[in-house]
């Protein structure tokens, strides 16, 4: 699942991770586009095991899912793309 | 010290059954996902399955459905491989190998079990 | 099952030489791979995962590369400790796959 966040917090990533995790470990992935309180794009991962880690916007692998998962959203085949916008 | 020790050779005759031992020690158990993985002589390797010792989820590569059954007792931090129905091409070594949550590939290995199967 | 092809089951070279071996995936996946160094009679270590990060206490002169379908591992100058088989794997889905093996032999 893949869902767009547009918040007014600061950073929540102080470490970023470009290490490739398997789709199969993965829950979610939120992403919080750069503005308001911080200056960067930030990409967390949501884990099965309940872990989150921050993955580096630029590591080739999730560029990669998230693509994939952008695709699958607009031909309405399962793992939809949600977008909330948090005040 | 991460070790992962390995029940000692077996020699089985052909359609019995077999189950072999790995003992792990000197991590947390549950933070590494065990997989067992074969490598018939002086080939290749190829991938069986994997046990979550969190929770006993196992995920197994279609080829050994059937043939392997993982499982895993925490309390002895030990996951376990049954074979069964053996033939002459399940005469291999098998080893055991852990990765955890941050490298997902398999950075601790057993030392090996071998298999022979033979009447 | 994803295929990963070795084209190289055997490589000669010398001590001192860079010696590049490949891997090639059957599909896309991404940079989910690792390489394993396996000495006759032990079991296989981990040098690479995720394509290119040096597993720790891998020495320097190991390094790995690409993404996608196609693999590069590289040694910069072999020692005479790095003659054994290397296995590229990948785990970008199950079953994870290995490729054939590629044995590094001194000329």
């Known amino acids: 699942v893949l869902e767009v966040y547009y918040t007014s917090l600061r950073c929540r990533c102080v470490q970023e991770s470009s290490v490739f995790i398997p789709r199969r470990f993965i829950d979610r992935i939120q992403i919080l586009p750069r503005g308001n309180g911080c200056p960067r794009k930030e990409i967390i991962v949501w884990k099965k095991n309940k872990s989150i880690v921050c993955v580096d916007p630029q590591a080739e692998w999730i560029q990669r899912m998230m693509e994939v998962l952008r695709k699958r959203s607009s031909s309405t085949l399962p793992v939809p793309v949600f977008k909330r916008k948090i005040p | 010290e991460v070790q992962l020790q390995q029940s000692g050779p077996e020699l089985v005759k052909p359609g019995a059954s077999v189950k072999i031992s790995c003992k792990a020690s000197?991590?947390?158990?549950?933070?590494?996902?065990m997989n067992w993985v074969r490598q018939s002589h002086g080939k290749s390797l190829e991938w069986i399955g994997d046990?979550?010792?969190?929770?006993?989820?196992?995920t197994y590569n279609q080829k050994f459905k059937g043939k392997a059954t993982l499982t895993v007792d925490t309390s002895s931090s030990t996951v376990y491989m049954e074979l069964r129905s053996l033939t002459s091409e399940d005469s291999a070594v098998y080893y055991c190998?852990?990765?955890?949550?941050?490298?997902?590939?398999?950075?601790?290995w057993g030392q090996g079990t071998s298999v022979t199967v033979s009447s | 099952d994803y295929v990963m092809t070795q084209s190289h089951k055997f490589m000669s070279t010398s001590v001192g030489d860079r010696v590049s071996i490949t891997c090639k995936a059957s599909?896309?996946?991404?940079?989910?791979v690792a390489w394993y160094q396996q000495n006759p009679g032990q079991s296989p270590k981990l040098l690479i995962y995720?394509?290119?990060h040096r597993y720790t206490g891998v020495p320097d002169r190991f390094t790995g590369s690409g993404s996608g379908t196609d693999f590069t591992f590289t040694i910069s100058s072999v020692q005479a400790e790095d003659l054994a088989v290397y296995y590229c794997?990948?785990?970008?889905?199950?079953?994870?796959?290995f490729g054939g093996g590629t044995k590094l032999e001194i000329k």
């Open positions: 190998a852990g990765y955890d949550e941050d490298h997902y590939a398999m950075d601790y």
């Open positions: 000197g991590y947390t158990f549950t933070d590494y996902y």
């Open positions: 046990i979550n010792p969190n929770n006993g989820d196992t």
């Open positions: 599909q896309d996946v991404s940079t989910g």
């Open positions: 995720s394509a290119s």
């Open positions: 794997q990948q785990y970008y889905t199950t079953p994870w796959t």
